[in-house]
């Protein structure tokens, strides 16, 4: 599938993660630029977007390994570079984000610092009550947890 075929939202996580320029005020922008934060901020923003790619890949891996995906070929297409549809719709699902936050936390801070940073942000949002608890039933599924335990203990390169 083409990148051009999607009508999904190309949205990011909350603005606080990327420390964005959220105010068009020119003086503020001058000040921030003098601190050298223009392109470095954008790099941080792209870091978070890459982490979303990782999260999506992780979700697709889990769903395919369990054979519970509605579209069972999504991970294969993603690995081939042809999967783009539904990326944002998955990521926009608050429950899915909660699930991924739970999932990634077990990976360890040193291995995936970008993902951990996002998980921490998700945790803050969760504490604020901005996440739903729709995934509780999934999290209670022991079989799924067994699979995730396997998933997070297996090196990514081993699963390719």
């Amino acid at each position: 599938r083409s990148l051009q075929d999607t009508e999904e939202k190309s949205r990011s996580f909350s603005a606080s993660q990327a420390d964005p320029l959220s105010d068009p005020d020119q003086m503020n922008e001058d000040k921030r630029h003098s601190q050298g934060t223009f392109t470095s901020d954008y790099s941080k923003y792209l870091d978070s977007r890459r982490a979303q790619d990782f999260v999506q890949w992780l979700m697709n891996t889990k769903r395919n390994r369990n054979n519970i995906a509605k579209r069972h070929d999504e991970f294969e297409r993603h690995a081939e570079g042809t999967f783009t549809s539904d990326v944002s719709s998955y990521l926009e699902g608050q429950a899915a984000k909660e699930f991924i936050a739970w999932l990634v936390k077990g990976r360890g801070r040193r291995d995936f610092p970008e993902e951990v940073a996002i998980v921490e942000e998700l945790g803050r949002r969760h504490a604020d009550g901005s996440f739903s608890d729709e995934m509780n039933t999934i999290l209670d599924n022991l079989a799924a947890r067994d699979f995730i335990n396997w998933l997070i203990q297996t090196k990514i390169t081993d699963r390719k």
Epitope: T6, P20, S43, D53
Partner: antibody, heavy 119, light 112 residues
């Protein structure tokens, strides 16, 4: 089909300002980040600035620090670039580009609008 | 910023022959978490805007002829045009989207 149509370019003197516009159609404009990329005559491509789907994230290349401001009006499906304190080196074709689902990847480009800075 | 360097700056290839363009990044654009290279190729014909050909280093965009192929990983990438056609005359740019986007200086492909 996706269409991006830039306007607002022209010949201006150094130090003056212009406002470039990009009218978008054929896709859900309010769902996508948008970029401006420029190309000096006979030269390569240079990324200029980005705005997220809702306008909450804005980033600029160092070369346009404090002088350029990107904005968008989702109700009008239009992207803007306010260019101030223009310099000779800002002379270029300015393209608006739609971001793909993957960040900083450009899947559609407008035809461009030429800005010439000359005294 | 990541610096992208293309070679050669220009090349002339006979119709039906193969054109090969190289692109080198000053640092890796491979994201190890998903094993994807954040590298794209664009084609720009005279008087036209760039057109996305390939993303993720090797994935053809929809509608792009299969004579175009991309390869490479990390810092070294290649765009190959098999069986060059007259309509392939253009300037080709690589671009990394791993970090603040930067482009190579372009490679002009002409008919010999």
């Amino acid at each position: 089909q996706v269409q991006l149509v830039e306007s607002g370019g022209g010949v201006v003197q150094p130090g003056r300002s212009l406002r470039l516009s990009c009218a978008a159609s054929g896709f859900a404009f309010s769902n996508y980040g948008m970029h401006w990329v420029r190309q000096a005559p006979g030269k390569g491509l240079e990324w200029v600035t980005f705005i997220s789907y809702d306008g909450s994230n804005k980033y600029y290349a160092d070369s346009v620090k404090g002088r350029f401001t990107i904005s968008r009006d989702n109700s009008k499906n239009t992207l803007y670039l306010q260019v101030n304190s223009l310099r000779a080196e800002d002379t270029a074709v300015y393209y608006c580009a739609k971001e793909a689902v993957l960040a900083a990847l450009f899947d559609y480009w407008g035809q461009g609008t030429l800005v010439t800075v000359s005294s | 910023d990541i610096v992208m360097t293309q070679s050669p700056d220009s090349l002339a290839v006979s119709l039906g022959e193969r054109a090969t363009i190289n692109c080198k990044s000053s640092q890796s654009v491979l994201y190890s978490s998903n094993n994807q290279n954040y590298l794209a190729w664009y084609q720009q014909k005279p008087g036209q805007p760039p057109k996305l050909l390939i993303y993720w280093a090797s994935t053809r965009e929809s509608g792009v002829p299969d004579r175009f192929s991309g390869s490479g990983s990390g810092t070294d990438f290649t765009l190959t045009i098999n069986s060059l056609q007259a309509e392939d005359v253009a300037v080709y740019y690589c671009q990394q989207y791993y970090s603040t986007p930067t482009f190579g200086q372009g490679t002009k492909v002409e008919i010999k």
